[in-house]
């Protein structure tokens, strides 16, 4: 106890009132109004609560404190008077600050400040929103992801910043007086083939196909090592060449001389080279057969094997490179007679006349071609005099129904040695190459050396066998007259074609040999 | 008739790039390739590579490779070089020539000098 | 690469003379060329494919051989001839020339 009269006890927040009594400060309570233990204690009283009667008047906040409160201008208001606190509803001059005025980059990039009482927001521009995470921060709205799907299928979505575009897709272009860019925009598909935007190789045939387009092969070509066919970028190679090579066991310098020269020509072969490649192949031809060389010394079955090569091989190398060639009429010459006639058109509907200076063809355009084949139609012939060296005494091989006719009434008539060639050996060509059945026949006119009397002449093809030989055979091939130096035959299939004379005597009009016509 | 005509001459700084023309007139341009041919002063004919107008192809000596860029522009019927990283020894006459493999090469152009000087 | 070897380097020879140099390749070739360049002027085709002379060639020139062995021949020299003769192979890439053949005037 205190001398003086005090207590010395008094909890913390009061004061005493004589030496067995405390009072709480202004600002706290106790239980009671008097405190007369030390147990008791004096709370903060909270005028701010509701039910209190401090009123600090609006667009301000009561703040309790320790044993007392202040009033302050709530967030987004601000005192005319300067006073950051004040006690009471007089006191109060709270009005609202325009934050927009104050800081002009409130709302950051594409977004417009807005005043509110106490308060701003941000209004973003046409294209962007609000950011959930940052409300004062716009950001561009993808229209393009945000499921308004707002372009049409033809088109794709390009969003940029604020805005988005729909723009034809690769390989489209705008309908015919459709933007391209805004949400209107209607797009078809681009032929890149008839306009000439493809990249395909010379090499390749341009196919379009939905939104792009591709390259394959041409026919007759393969795409080369490593790269795959239908690609933009496939380039192809030309296989005439690769395939017409030497012939298996026949060993001859002059023939090796020849594949080398073919194989050179198709190294570094190109389409545009197509004509300049023909006369080239023509030529070593030529040479070949008027300077046979060795080949003269191989055995005549091998001679054989050798000209059933040449003769299959320049059927389909022609053939291929003349797909090659533009659209007319191509005659060439060499010095040994080998002679090519050549004709090169879009499909017509007439029939065609190929003219030499030993022979002549006449055929139906319409055989030319194989349907869906969107390459030109090509009808050729070649006259190959020379290959008459290596044909000499090759076999003819008749029919079995006809030879049996001919042993029953000509027994012995046939032993007389190998048929004489009387003709150039002439090959016929299509741009088709499925020429074994001719919807309408091929005529052909030869001329000839002068037939020897009571001897009977015979339209012949070159027949190729398994063994990769061959034989003259009638099968398919009719005379439909002969004079002294010219015969004329029709055939159904196109191949390799000659005019042989029999070595046996011809009967007045006897029946059994217009049979084997 | 065939003619191969070449640019003028060029005087070029060590480390340049020239670009020589060779303007084909008179056949089907794609019928043939372009050739390139150097002849050093006093030197024989090396091939330098050929392109083919039809498709762009190239094709190139190993030595020239990265060296001489061949192009052709089919619409004014015009084969270019390029010859880059130029040193003295690039000094030459360089020639066009259409070729064919079976008919080498039968039209030559003029030849074109180029000089390599600092 | 296909080499080809020209020999002899330079000869000489007079007006009426026969002329022969050869082209050796070091592998086989098919297509042989021979072209006849002048002192500043651009090299002209003289003999394509072996033997066949090119357009306005004088048939005095001519050209044989086979695999790696080619001959071009001056069956009578005219002044007009002295100039240096290349041979070139379009057998195998890349394209070479030989070095050259230079005929001068004895």
């Known amino acids: 106890q205190d001398s003086r009269g005090c207590a010395r006890w008094c909890p913390q927040d009061s004061s005493c009132v004589n030496a067995t009594a405390c009072r709480c400060n202004p600002g706290f309570s106790s239980f009671s109004e008097i405190i007369t233990t030390p147990m008791e204690t004096c709370d903060d009283i909270n005028e701010c609560a509701t039910l209190s009667k401090v009123s600090c008047g609006k667009f301000s906040d009561c703040w309790n404190t320790e044993g007392s409160y202040d009033c302050v201008c709530s967030p987004g208001y601000e005192p005319v008077s300067g006073a950051k606190t004040f006690k009471n509803e007089s006191e109060n001059t709270c009005q609202d600050v325009d934050e927009c005025q104050q800081n002009p980059r409130l709302c950051k990039s594409y977004g417009t400040c807005v005043n509110t009482l106490g308060s701003y927001t941000c209004q973003c521009l046409p294209g962007f929103k609000l950011k959930p995470e940052d409300p004062k921060l716009c950001t561009d709205v993808n229209e393009c992801t945000s499921g308004q799907n707002p372009c049409h299928s033809s088109t794709h979505c390009l969003n940029n910043v604020g805005s988005y575009q729909c723009r034809c897709r690769p390989g489209w272009q705008p309908i015919p007086g459709s933007p391209n860019g805004p949400n209107n925009t209607v797009c078809e598909d681009v032929d890149e083939c008839s306009s000439g935007q493809h990249q395909c190789d010379s090499s390749t045939v341009c196919f379009n196909t939905v939104g792009s387009y591709s390259c394959r092969c041409r026919p007759g070509w393969k795409p080369r090592h490593g790269i795959p066919n239908n690609q933009k970028d496939t380039v192809c190679e030309d296989m005439t060449f690769s395939t017409w090579t030497p012939p298996p066991g026949v060993h001859s310098q002059t023939l090796s001389r020849f594949f080398d020269k073919v194989q050179d020509l198709g190294r570094d072969y190109k389409p545009g080279l197509a004509n300049n490649t023909i006369q080239s192949i023509l030529q070593a031809l030529d040479e070949l057969l008027e300077a046979p060389g060795d080949l003269e010394t191989l055995p005549r079955l091998q001679q054989h094997c050798v000209a059933s090569h040449l003769l299959d091989g320049l059927e389909d190398v022609l053939r291929g490179l003349s797909k090659n060639l533009s659209n007319g009429l191509l005659n060439f010459s060499y010095p040994a007679g080998t002679e090519l006639s050549l004709e090169v058109q879009k499909q017509v509907d007439r029939s065609v006349t190929l003219r030499q200076n030993q022979a002549v063809m006449q055929l139906d355009w319409n055989q030319a071609q194989k349907s869906g084949d969107p390459g030109p139609s090509v009808v050729g012939l070649v006259s190959i005099p020379g290959m008459g060296k290596l044909l000499a005494e090759a076999p003819l091989v008749l029919e079995p129904e006809k030879q049996m006719l001919l042993h029953e009434t000509h027994q012995g008539l046939l032993q007389d040695g190998s048929p004489i060639l009387l003709s150039d050996v002439i090959s016929a060509f299509l741009s088709n190459n499925d020429t074994q059945n001719l919807s309408s026949p091929v005529t052909f006119t030869f001329s000839h050396r002068s037939v020897i009397p009571r001897q009977k002449v015979l339209c012949v093809f070159w027949e190729h066998g398994q063994n990769g030989c061959g034989h003259w055979a009638t099968t398919g091939c009719s005379t439909i007259g002969t004079r002294d130096t010219s015969t004329i035959c029709r055939c159904t299939h196109l191949s390799s074609f000659a005019v042989l004379m029999a070595h046996y005597d011809v009967q007045e009009e006897d029946p059994v040999l217009t049979v084997i016509t | 008739q065939v003619q191969l005509q070449q640019s003028g001459a060029e005087v070029a700084k060590p480390g340049a790039s020239v670009k020589l023309s060779c303007k084909a007139s008179?056949?089907?341009?794609?019928?043939?390739?372009m050739q390139w041919i150097k002849q050093a002063p006093g030197q024989g004919l090396e091939w330098i590579g050929a392109v083919y107008p039809g498709d762009g192809d190239t094709r190139h000596t190993q030595k020239f490779k990265g060296k001489a860029t061949l192009t052709a522009d089919k619409s004014t019927s015009t084969a270019y070089m390029e010859v880059s990283s130029l040193r003295s020894e690039d000094t030459a006459v360089y020639y066009c020539?259409?070729?064919?493999?079976?008919?080498?090469?039968?039209?030559w152009g003029q030849g074109t000098t180029v000089t390599v000087s600092s | 690469e296909i080499v080809l070897t020209q020999s002899p380097a330079t000869m000489s020879a007079s007006p009426g003379e026969r002329v022969t140099m050869s082209c050796s390749a070091s592998s086989s070739v098919s297509y042989m060329h021979w072209y006849q360049q002048k002192s500043g002027q651009s090299p002209k085709r003289w003999i394509y494919d072996t033997s066949k002379l090119a357009s306005g060639v004088p048939a005095r020139f001519s050209g044989s051989g086979s695999g790696t062995d080619y001959t071009f021949t001056i069956s009578s020299m005219e002044p007009e001839d002295f100039a240096t003769y290349y041979c070139?192979?379009?057998?195998?890439?890349?394209?070479?020339f030989g070095g050259g053949t230079k005929l001068e005037i004895k």
């Open positions: 008179g056949y089907t341009f794609t019928n043939y390739w």
């Open positions: 070139q192979q379009w057998s195998s890439n890349p394209l070479t």
């Open positions: 020539a259409r070729g064919f493999t079976a008919y080498g090469m039968d039209y």
